[in-house]
Interface confidence: low
C-alpha cells in the first residue's frame, strides 16, 4: 500500500513579509517524526501522530517547501509552492519636456521598482485616463517607454504611469499603483518671423507707434514679447486674439540714439524664438530758426535777417540758399516804410537715407515810421449836396498806427472819417485832417463845398 504525505495549504499566495501556517500530515500508521525542509525561517508549532504544524515567518520571496517522513523505512515527501506577491515600491513617470512642439514625438518613460510576481505585473502609460501603452514589467527596475505624437489637445493634459498587479486568478484581486501625474505643455511656433510695422525715420524726442504681429501661435497667451529700439526696451501692450499675438508700443528716440538703429521684435514660446528686425534712422532736425537783428526797426536803419538749422540741413532764406548744408543764410536791408509787416520765409531741407524732409519757418518785420495820409485815398476838394449822406474816405498810415481827425478851421467842429454822415450847409469850409502818433504829425487840407438844396 502507498501512503501519502499531504502539505497544506497547497500552493498558497501571500503578501511579501507575511507569515504562513503549514500543516504536514500522513496516513502512514507507523510514521516517524515529520520534517519540513525550507530556507525560510520556521518554527514547529505542534505535532502529533502522523502530523506536524509549522509557522513560516517573514516570507519575502517565492519558495518551495518540502515535508518528508520515513514510513516503514522508506521516505515519502510532499511539497507546496509559496507564491509571494508585493506591490511596487516606486512607480515614477520621468519628467516631461518643459515645452513640446505640436506634431513632434516625445517619449514617456516610466520606472517601476519592486513588485512581484513579475509575471502578473503590467505597466500602463496613460494620458488622462486613456491607455497609451500596456507592457509587461521586465527586469528590475522595470523601465517602460512609449512614443507619443504631441497635439494641441495635449496642452495641459496629465500623463501618468500605472502598475497593475493581477492576483485575480489567485482570488486576491487587482492591485493598482499610480505615479504622480505630470502635465505636458505643447506649443506651436510658426517658422515665419513676426510682422513688424515701424517707421523708417524717427526724429529725436518724437514718438511713433510700433506694431509687431505673429499669427499661428499656440498658446498665444504664453508667448513672451520683447520690443526694442536699439538697446532701449519698449513698453509693449500685448493682445491675444485666437492664435494671433499683437504687441504695440510707442517708440521715442533719444538724442544719444541718433543715426542708424534697429527696431527688434522677439516672440518667445516654448524656449524657441522668432525675430523680426527693421532698420530705422533716428535724426535730429533743429529749426529752421529765422532771426531779425531788430524785430522792430526804425525807418532807414539796417536790418539783418538770418536763418539757421542743425548740422547737415540746407536752408534757403527768401529764395537765397545758404552756401552749404549746416551754414546760415543771411540778407541785409535798409528798413523802409514798405518793409513794415514784411514776412521773411526760410525753408530747411534735410536728407535722411535718400529721403528729403522739409520744414518752413517765417518771421515778420516791424518798421517804425511817422504818420502819413494817402492823398490818393483822401480827396482834397469835395463837392457835395446839402442834405445828402456821404463818407469822408481818408486813410492814414504809420507805425505805430496814427489817429486821424478832421477839424474845421476856425472852430472845433469835427467831421467823422470813414463813417457815413448827413451833410448840410454848415459843413461848408476848410478842414485840417491830421494824422498823429508818437512819431509825429501829418496834416492835409480838405475843402468841403456844400451846394445848397434848391426848392424849385
Amino acid at each position: 500500500q502507498e501512503f501519502l504525505l499531504r502539505v497544506e495549504p497547497q500552493n498558497p499566495v501571500l503578501s511579501a513579509g507575511g507569515s504562513l501556517f503549514v500543516n504536514c500530515s500522513t496516513d502512514c500508521p507507523s510514521s516517524e517524526k515529520i520534517a519540513l525542509e525550507t530556507s525560510l525561517s520556521k518554527e514547529l508549532v505542534a505535532s502529533g501522530m502522523g502530523w506536524a504544524a509549522f509557522n513560516l515567518s517573514n516570507v519575502t520571496g517565492n519558495s518551495r517547501i518540502l515535508c518528508s517522513v520515513y514510513c516503514n523505512g522508506s521516505q515519502i515527501t510532499g511539497s507546496s509552492n509559496i507564491t509571494v506577491y508585493g506591490l511596487p515600491e516606486r512607480v515614477e513617470l520621468a519628467p516631461l519636456p518643459p515645452w513640446q512642439p505640436v506634431g513632434q514625438n516625445f517619449t514617456l518613460r516610466c520606472q517601476v521598482e519592486g513588485g512581484s510576481p513579475r509575471t502578473s505585473l503590467t505597466v500602463v502609460l496613460l494620458r488622462w485616463e486613456e491607455e497609451l501603452s500596456r507592457q509587461p514589467a521586465v527586469e528590475e527596475p522595470a523601465e517602460v517607454t512609449a512614443t507619443v505624437l504631441a497635439s494641441r489637445d495635449d496642452h495641459g493634459a496629465p500623463f501618468s504611469c500605472r502598475t497593475e498587479l493581477d492576483m485575480q486568478p489567485q482570488g486576491l484581486g487587482l492591485f493598482v499603483n499610480t505615479s504622480a501625474p505630470r502635465q505636458l505643455r505643447t506649443f506651436v511656433l510658426p517658422v515665419t518671423p513676426p510682422r513688424l510695422v515701424a517707421p523708417r525715420f524717427l526724429e529725436v524726442e518724437t514718438s511713433w507707434p510700433v506694431d509687431c504681429t505673429l499669427d499661428g501661435l499656440f498658446p498665444a497667451s504664453e508667448a513672451q514679447v520683447y520690443l526694442a529700439l536699439g538697446d532701449q526696451m519698449l513698453n509693449a501692450t500685448v493682445m491675444n486674439h485666437g492664435d494671433t499675438l499683437t504687441a504695440t508700443a510707442t517708440a521715442t528716440a533719444r538724442a544719444d540714439q541718433e543715426g542708424a538703429r534697429e527696431i527688434v521684435c522677439n516672440v518667445t514660446l516654448g524656449g524657441e524664438r522668432r525675430e523680426a528686425r527693421e532698420n530705422l534712422t533716428v535724426f535730429s532736425f533743429l529749426g529752421p530758426i529765422v532771426n531779425l537783428s531788430e524785430p522792430t526797426a526804425h525807418e532807414g536803419s539796417t536790418v539783418t535777417v538770418s536763418c539757421m538749422a542743425g548740422a547737415r540741413v540746407q536752408v534757403t532764406l527768401d529764395g537765397v540758399p545758404a552756401a552749404a548744408p549746416g551754414q546760415t543764410a543771411q540778407l541785409q536791408l535798409n528798413a523802409t516804410e514798405s518793409d513794415d509787416g514784411r514776412s521773411f520765409f526760410c525753408s530747411a531741407t534735410l536728407e535722411v537715407d535718400g529721403e528729403f524732409l522739409h520744414r518752413n519757418s517765417s518771421v515778420q518785420l516791424r518798421v517804425l515810421y511817422g504818420p502819413k495820409i494817402d492823398r490818393a485815398t483822401c480827396p482834397q476838394h469835395l463837392k457835395w449836396k446839402d442834405k445828402t449822406r456821404h463818407v469822408l474816405q481818408c486813410q492814414a498810415r504809420g507805425n505805430p498806427y496814427p489817429e486821424l481827425r478832421c477839424l474845421k478851421e476856425g472852430s472845433s467842429r469835427e467831421v467823422p472819417v470813414g463813417i457815413p454822415f448827413f451833410v448840410n450847409v454848415t459843413h461848408n469850409g476848410t478842414y485840417q485832417c491830421q494824422a498823429s502818433s508818437s512819431r509825429g504829425k501829418y496834416t492835409l487840407v480838405v475843402v468841403m463845398d456844400i451846394e445848397a438844396f434848391s426848392s424849385h
Epitope: V138, E140, E143
Partner: antibody, heavy 119, light 112 residues
Framework: QIQLVQSGAEVKKPGASVKVSCKAS????????ILWVRQAPGQGLEWMGK????????TYAQKFQGRVTITADTSTSTAYMELSSLRSEDTAVYYC????????????WGQGTLVTVSS | DAVMTQTPLSLPVSLGDQASISCRSS???????????LHWYLQKPGQSPQLLIY???NRFSGVPDRFSGSGSGTDFTLKLSRVEAEDLGVYFC?????????FGGGTKLEIK
C-alpha cells in the same frame, strides 16, 4: 551613423583601478541602454552590467558586484565603466554596446579597450 | 544563471557549403511577456562582435539572407546556407531573458 567610440588601451598594476569611457553619437543617448562586456584573451564573452542613462539606474552581474561602477554623463553622451581592485585575470578587452530596449539584443558595439593588469 | 552551451566548438567548412551551429540553454528562454530573447553574434578576427540575429529568427539590418535562426524554449540553431569567406570568425549565441545576460562559449567557423 551610430557609433560607440571607446578610450585607448590601459596598463595597470594589480590592486589599481581602471576607468574606460564610451562616447556615443548618431542617436539620442538617453533613449538606449549601455552595456559592458569583456573578453579575456582567447576566451568567450562575459557580461558585466548595464546602465539606463535616462534614469541613471544600473544592474551589475553578481560576479562584479562591489568592484564595478557604471556611470553615464548625458551632457557629453558618454558612458564609463570603472573596475577596481584589479587582478591579473582582469586582463581583457572591454567592450561597450548599446541596446534599444529591455531586454533586446546589443545592436551596436564599441571597438573595444584592452586593459592589461601586470606587476 | 542561464548557462549557454554551443556545439560544435570548431566547424571546418568549404566555401559554398552549408553550416549549422547549435545552442542550448540550461533554462527556458521564454520571457513572461511571451518573447524569446536569444540572439546570435559574429566576431570576425580582430574585430568587435556584430549582431546577426535577434529574438531567435529576426535578421538585423544589413545581414544577408543566407543567415537564418530557429528554435524555441531551450534549443536553438543558426544556419548558413552557403558559406562565404567573409563569414569566417567566431559565432556566439546569447540570452537576455534572464539577468545576468550570458553568452555561449563560441563556435569557430574555419576553412577546411
Amino acid at each position: 551613423q551610430i557609433q560607440l567610440v571607446q578610450s585607448g588601451a590601459e596598463v595597470k598594476k594589480p590592486g589599481a583601478s581602471v576607468k574606460v569611457s564610451c562616447k556615443a553619437s548618431g542617436y539620442t543617448f538617453t533613449d538606449c541602454i549601455i552595456l559592458w562586456v569583456r573578453q579575456a584573451p582567447g576566451q568567450g564573452l562575459e557580461w558585466m552590467g548595464k546602465i539606463n542613462p535616462y534614469f541613471g539606474t544600473t544592474t551589475y552581474a553578481q560576479k562584479f558586484q562591489g568592484r564595478v561602477t557604471i556611470t553615464a554623463d548625458t551632457s557629453t553622451s558618454t558612458a564609463y565603466m570603472e573596475l577596481s581592485s584589479l587582478r591579473s585575470e582582469d586582463t581583457a578587452v572591454y567592450y561597450c554596446a548599446r541596446k534599444e530596449a529591455y531586454p533586446d539584443a546589443m545592436d551596436y558595439w564599441g571597438q573595444g579597450t584592452l586593459v592589461t593588469v601586470s606587476s | 544563471d542561464a548557462v549557454m552551451t554551443q556545439t560544435p566548438l570548431s566547424l571546418p567548412v568549404s566555401l559554398g557549403d552549408q553550416a549549422s551551429i547549435s545552442c542550448r540553454s540550461s533554462q527556458s528562454l521564454v520571457h513572461s511577456n511571451g518573447d524569446t530573447y536569444l540572439h546570435w553574434y559574429l566576431q570576425k578576427p580582430g574585430q568587435s562582435p556584430q549582431l546577426l540575429i535577434y529574438k531567435v529568427s529576426n535578421r538585423f539590418s544589413g545581414v544577408p539572407d543566407r543567415f537564418s535562426g530557429s528554435g524555441s524554449g531551450t534549443d536553438f540553431t543558426l544556419k548558413l546556407s552557403r558559406v562565404e569567406a567573409e563569414d569566417l570568425g567566431v559565432y556566439f549565441c546569447s540570452q537576455s531573458t534572464h539577468v545576468p545576460y550570458t553568452f555561449g562559449g563560441g563556435t569557430k567557423l574555419e576553412i577546411k
